[in-house]
């Protein structure tokens, strides 16, 4: 079973003498999700050659995965804490439909996929408490998400494998960008 944040994990140092601060909790939580993604990527790469494929652009056309850009205020040049937090939360909310898609894509790591999805929901809640400008956060339309999910699930096997690989790779990159930006706050 997946190790929950707060329990022993390979990327957590000596126990804290005091309760975790909000920033520390968020940081630890992201690292926990990254652990989960790592496990899921292992299974994906073991069962298909998607991780070495050069045909990623074909599948990427169907996806609109959130990505950090300079205008989002999370990069050092033009860093803006409020704008950046809005981008992080909005991006995580946009990833939720893709994490839902991943739920039936794993055999041996089914629990891990669920843990990544649930931990992301918790992370969004942590970050929403930290954000001042909640009005600026746009939540994806449920109907849009539902039709996107249907479309993704209707793809052929090769495209579904490629989509799984791309979601995991992009989510990992997005979380790494989050980790970096949040540590500057």
């Amino acid at each position: 079973a997946p190790v929950l944040p707060g329990e022993d994990s390979k990327n957590v140092a000596a126990p804290h003498s005091q309760p975790l601060t909000s920033s520390e909790r968020i940081d630890k939580h992201i690292r926990y999700i990254l652990d989960g993604i790592s496990a899921l990527r292992k299974e994906t790469c073991n069962r298909s050659n998607m991780c070495e494929s050069s045909k990623e652009a074909l599948a990427e056309n169907n996806l609109n995965l959130p990505k950090m850009a300079e205008k989002d205020g999370c990069f050092q040049s033009g860093f803006n804490e409020d704008t950046c937090l809005v981008k992080i939360i909005t991006g995580l909310l946009e990833f939720e439909v893709y994490l839902e898609y991943l739920q039936n894509r794993f055999e041996s790591s089914e629990e891990q996929a669920r843990a990544v999805q649930m931990s992301t929901k918790v992370l969004i809640q942590f970050l929403q408490k930290k954000a001042k400008n909640l009005d600026a956060i746009t939540t994806p339309e449920p109907t849009t998400n539902a039709s996107l999910l249907t479309k993704l699930q209707a793809q052929n096997q090769w495209l579904q494998d490629m989509t799984t690989h791309l979601i995991l790779r992009s989510f990992k990159e997005f979380l790494q960008s989050n980790l970096r930006a949040l540590r500057q706050m």
């Epitope: 990327n11 140092a13 000596a14 601060t21 990254l34 050092q76 990159e173 970096r180 540590r183 500057q184």
Partner: antibody, heavy 122, light 107 residues
């Protein structure tokens, strides 16, 4: 096998601009979580971090030197370039480039170049 | 900026001895602390990342510990090749900062 190597002038005159190139192999600077940094060490002194560039082109500079530094990358050539303007004798040091690459962004430099000694003198 | 302070600035010990050096951060950095070893005329080498994780290939006689603002590096059963200078590094946030170093002499 991951390797990095610094190249550039060994001697520069005061007020001149120093351009150092870090050529690397064994990894890609387009992989998420990967970055390359520059660190210098004046003779007999401690390490001083100068600049850092990430896979997505996010750049960080030492606040005390920011106005003089520029870091850029050429992913296709596997190179990172550092320029430092208005060189002064106190900038005499061994300049290292180093790689950081881990999922959790621990900002740890796991592989270093051999370093290049730059002397600033007229 | 986060200031890093190392103590002692130098120490000497015999082969087979154990030593401990410390590093303080001016504010909490969680477990984001790295240790490096540098021999004269050579580039630094990563020993420990994230306060307590040994870098691949580093002997188990090295041990890092600590969190928040106080960190230690312990070397058991010293070997001649352990001589040199040890640097700690704030890896929590930019600007990255190094400690002044601890110079270890093996007698």
């Amino acid at each position: 096998q991951v390797t990095l190597k610094e190249s550039g002038p060994t001697l520069v005159k005061p007020t001149q601009t120093l351009t150092l190139t870090c050529s690397f192999s064994g990894f890609s600077l387009s992989t998420s979580g990967v970055g390359v940094g520059w660190v210098r060490q004046p003779p007999g002194k401690a390490l001083e971090w100068l600049a850092f560039i990430w896979w997505d082109d996010d750049k960080y500079y030492s606040p005390s030197l920011e106005s003089r530094l520029t870091i850029t990358k050429d992913t296709s050539k596997n190179q990172v370039v550092l320029t430092m303007t208005n060189m002064d004798p106190v900038d005499t040091a061994t300049y290292y480039c180093a790689r950081s690459a881990d999922d959790y962004l621990y900002y740890s430099f796991d592989t270093w170049g051999q370093g290049t000694l730059v002397t600033v003198s007229s | 900026d986060i200031q890093m302070t190392q103590s002692p600035s130098s120490l000497s010990a015999f082969v087979g001895d154990g030593v401990t050096m410390t590093c303080w951060a001016s504010q909490s950095i969680n477990d984001y602390l790295n240790w490096y070893h540098q021999r004269p005329g050579e580039a630094p080498e990563l020993l420990v990342f994230a306060a307590s994780n040994l870098q691949i290939g580093v002997p188990s006689r090295f041990r890092g510990s600590g969190s928040e603002t106080y960190f230690t590096l312990t070397i058991n059963s010293l070997q001649p090749e352990d001589s040199g200078t040890y640097f700690c590094q704030n890896a929590h946030s930019f600007p990255l900062t190094f400690g002044g170093g601890t110079k270890l002499e093996i007698k």
